[in-house]
């Protein structure tokens, strides 16, 4: 006889990276007929929802109206059908951003490179942090960690056109509290033989559209909660 129900999916909308004082919704998707959902934060019960009518609902939402560092951390959820509880969901790392300061991001040898050249990103932040994160925009929300007193290096190795895209970095005060994002750097990779010297390191869009990026770039992942769950879970491990 089955002792537990399958684990639910957990994700954050619009994104697991939440600017401070902005709103976020944590979604938990279980099964139709679940009479109770529990959201746990850092291992303790945080909130409970009892959907009505349970047979018509398989997802609940826990709304956080005002994100701050106390709300940042690891969330999981479980649900109950009758007396039977589910396995806990994977952990969702909810990150508060726009804390304290803004790092600067530079790329060597420059933002326009030729396929096969080795590229290194440098993220610098003068305030007290020793961990840095480099993110490339796009579906996979690929994150690299780097360490250093005021700056960190992110070597990409010999680049291909797959490395094309817009990059930003953050300083991390702890695993779940990140700085403001840096201005974006758009990396252009060409296979052509052409003079790319002194190609300006222009931002592709201003910093205030970062919020829009958070709302839009993970759409594909939100449609596939399993993949999104996996991405969020592995981000900070």
């Amino acid at each position: 006889q089955q002792q537990t129900l399958p684990k639910p999916f957990i994700w954050a909308e619009p994104h697991f990276m939440v600017p401070k004082e902005k709103q976020v919704t944590i979604c938990c998707q279980g099964n139709y007929g679940a009479v109770e959902y529990q959201l746990h934060f850092e291992g303790s019960l945080f909130a409970v929802d009892r959907p009505k009518p349970p047979e018509r609902i398989n997802k609940v939402q826990f709304y956080i109206p005002d994100m701050n560092s106390r709300m940042a951390g690891q969330y999981s959820c479980i649900y109950r059908v009758g007396e039977l509880w589910s396995e806990p969901s994977n952990l969702l790392d909810l990150v508060v951003t726009e804390m304290y300061d803004t790092p600067t991001l530079s790329v060597h040898p420059g933002p326009e490179v030729i396929s096969g050249e080795k590229v290194t990103f440098y993220c610098r932040l003068d305030t007290a942090t020793s961990m840095f994160l480099l993110l490339k925009e796009g579906r996979s929300s690929h994150v690299q960690r780097g360490y250093g007193k005021v700056q960190a290096e992110f070597p990409l190795g010999p680049v291909t056109t797959a490395h094309r895209g817009t990059y930003r970095c953050f300083g991390s005060y702890n695993n779940h509290a990140w700085s403001f994002p840096s201005e974006p750097v758009k990396l252009l990779v060409t296979g052509d033989i052409e003079n790319t010297s002194l190609a300006p390191e222009d931002p592709t869009f201003p910093a205030d559209t970062w919020g829009t990026y958070l709302l839009t770039t993970e759409t594909g992942l939100q449609k596939d909660h399993a993949l999104w769950d996996h991405t969020a879970q592995n981000l900070l491990r």
């Epitope: 600067t104 530079s106 420059g110 030729i114 096969g116 050249e117 080795k118 033989i193 790319t196 002194l198």
Partner: antibody, heavy 115, light 107 residues
Framework: QVQLQQPGAELVKPGASVRLSCKAF????????MHWVKQRPGQGLEWIGM????????KYNEKFKSKATLTVDKSSSTAYMQLSSLTSEDSAVYFC????????WGQGTLVTVSA | DIQMTQSPSSLSASLGERVSLTCRAS??????LNWLQQEPDGTIKRLIY???SLDSGVPKRFSGSRSGSDYSLTISSLESEDFVDYYC?????????FGGGTKLEIK
Amino acid sequence: QVQLQQPGAELVKPGASVRLSCKAFGYTFTSYWMHWVKQRPGQGLEWIGMIHPNSGVTKYNEKFKSKATLTVDKSSSTAYMQLSSLTSEDSAVYFCAGDGRFAYWGQGTLVTVSA
Amino acid sequence: DIQMTQSPSSLSASLGERVSLTCRASQDIGNSLNWLQQEPDGTIKRLIYATSSLDSGVPKRFSGSRSGSDYSLTISSLESEDFVDYYCLQYASSPWTFGGGTKLEIK
């Protein structure tokens, strides 16, 4: 026309410090890396370090970490390298080179360390 | 640090001759290699970047290529102003390092 302007020569006493300048013309100074390179008389080239004027990121050759300090003045589009505790080993020509790939070079400053 | 072994250290050749200079990298540097030219007065000019990209204003007789960890600068037909010093430079892994140089002399 991109140009990197460096003074021709500096004569300094042993134990003293010197600040070398490199003024950039003809491009957006803040957008590109600036490198510094050493060449001893009749010898090859040695990379000292680089600075990104916009971000303030610096990267040094470990060999020169306690010898050289790189700074910039964005308002005058000038890069500086301070060399400290000078000895005869520091007598050399010092070049600045603009752009991550060393696209443009200054004429070099001859530093002579002599009592 | 990555060692760049440049050969030959000096080379005597005649006007119109085709010559090749080589740099061998001790570690993988991808295509992150420049060739530089230094005149007797100390002036340095970049000829080639990213292994094979010719700088604007550089004569077409100069070309760069790669075979594994060996990088070559070829001058297809030597002219009088080519008899100067040449250096390779890798910018793949910090500290960026130079080859020991090749002195090209007229025969």
